[in-house]
C-alpha cells in the first residue's frame, strides 16, 4: 500500500545559477494524497531559517505532483543564498533539503572592466 505521507522532493545539494534582473521561479515539488498541505518557504541565515513573508508564491499542478513556487520578479543580488520549503501536515512539520541560489549581478559584471581592459589601462 502506497504511503500517504507528505513528501518534499528537493534534491540534496540542489543549486541554481541565476541572473539578477530577470525573473525566476523556485519550485518545491510536493507529493500528497488527499488534502494539500500548507507549505511555506524560508531562507537560511546561519543555522536559522527565516520565514519569507510578503513574497509572491503560487501552486502549479502537474500529473500527480504539485509544485509550490516562490516567485522572484525579478531576482535581486540579495536573493543569493539557500532556501528551504516546509509543509505542515497533520500537526507534523516536514522540511525539504535546502536549495541554493547563486546570483550573478549582471550590472556590476557588465560595468566591471575585463582583465584585458585592466591590463591595457595599466600599461598605457
Amino acid at each position: 500500500k502506497e504511503s500517504c505521507d507528505v513528501q518534499l522532493y528537493i534534491k540534496r545539494r540542489s543549486e541554481h545559477s541565476i541572473l539578477a534582473g530577470d525573473p525566476f521561479e523556485l519550485e518545491c515539488p510536493v507529493k500528497y494524497c488527499a488534502n494539500r498541505p500548507h507549505v511555506t518557504w524560508c531562507k537560511l541565515n546561519g543555522t536559522t531559517c527565516v520565514k519569507l513573508e510578503d513574497r509572491q508564491t503560487s501552486w502549479k499542478e502537474e500529473k500527480n505532483i504539485s509544485f509550490f513556487i516562490l516567485h522572484f520578479e525579478p531576482v535581486l543580488p540579495n536573493d543569493n543564498g539557500s532556501y528551504r520549503c516546509s509543509a505542515n501536515f497533520q500537526s507534523n512539520l516536514i522540511e525539504s533539503h535546502s536549495t541554493t541560489l547563486y546570483v550573478t549581478d549582471v550590472k556590476s559584471a557588465s560595468e566591471r572592466p575585463s582583465k584585458d581592459e585592466m591590463a591595457s589601462r595599466f600599461w598605457a
Epitope: L19, A20, G21, D22, P23, E53, D54, R55, Q56, H71, E73, P74, L76, P77, N78, V106, K107, S110
Partner: antibody, heavy 120, light 106 residues
Framework: QVQLKESGPGLVAPSQSLSITCTVS????????VHWVRQSPGKGLEWLGV???????SYNPAPMSRLSISKDNSKSQVFLKMNSLQTDDTAMYYC??????????????WGQGTSVTVSS | QIVLSQSPAILSASPGEKVTMTCRAS?????MHWYQQKPGSSPKPWIY???NLASGVPARFSGSGSGTSYSLTISRMEAEDAATYYC?????????FGGGTKLEIK
Amino acid sequence: QVQLKESGPGLVAPSQSLSITCTVSGFSLTTYGVHWVRQSPGKGLEWLGVMWPGGRTSYNPAPMSRLSISKDNSKSQVFLKMNSLQTDDTAMYYCVRGDYEYDYYAMDYWGQGTSVTVSS
Amino acid sequence: QIVLSQSPAILSASPGEKVTMTCRASSSVSYMHWYQQKPGSSPKPWIYATSNLASGVPARFSGSGSGTSYSLTISRMEAEDAATYYCHQWSSNPYTFGGGTKLEIK
C-alpha cells in the same frame, strides 16, 4: 543619458488593436527590463506588463489576455500590442525602465508618454 | 491584488508647514515606492524602497513605514512641492499604484 520614447497611433477605433513602440537609448535591453504603464482619468496609474532582460514577460492578469509585449534588442525597441480596445483603454501610455539595487526593484526612468484615444 | 489607498486625496498646505500623506496596503508589502507627478509631465521617482530619496530630491522629504502602512513627509512645505504623489508596491503581481494625493499650496 538614459532616454525612452514612445510612438503610437494617437487614435484607435473601438475593437481595433493598439501598437506602441518604445525606443530606448543610454542602456541595453539585455541588462534592464522595460515596463508599460498607462494612466487614465478613471483608473489612475496601471501597470500593464514588463519585458525582462532575458526575454521573458510578465503581465498584469486583468488585461493580460489582450496584451502582448515583445522586443528587438538590436534596435533597442520594445513593443506593446493590445487587442480589442474599448473606450476605457483611452489613456496616456508610458514605457519605463526597471532597475534593481541590492535588495529592491523599482521603475526609474519614464518616457514622456504617448496619448491614445479610443473613439469611432 | 494588493490595493493601495492614499489619504487624503487632496491636501492643502502653507509654505513652511509640515505635511504628511499616507498609503495603506490591503496586504503586507516589503517596501513602498513614491512618485511625484506634475501636470503635463511623466511621474518621477521620488522615494525608493520606503525611505531612500531619489537623486535630486530635497532633504526635506522623508519616507517611512512597514507592513501595510507607509507615509511620505515634507518637513517644510515649499511651492515647488505642489504636485500629485503616488505610492507604488513591487511585492506582488499585479504591481499596483495608489490613487494619488494631490498636494496644493495655500
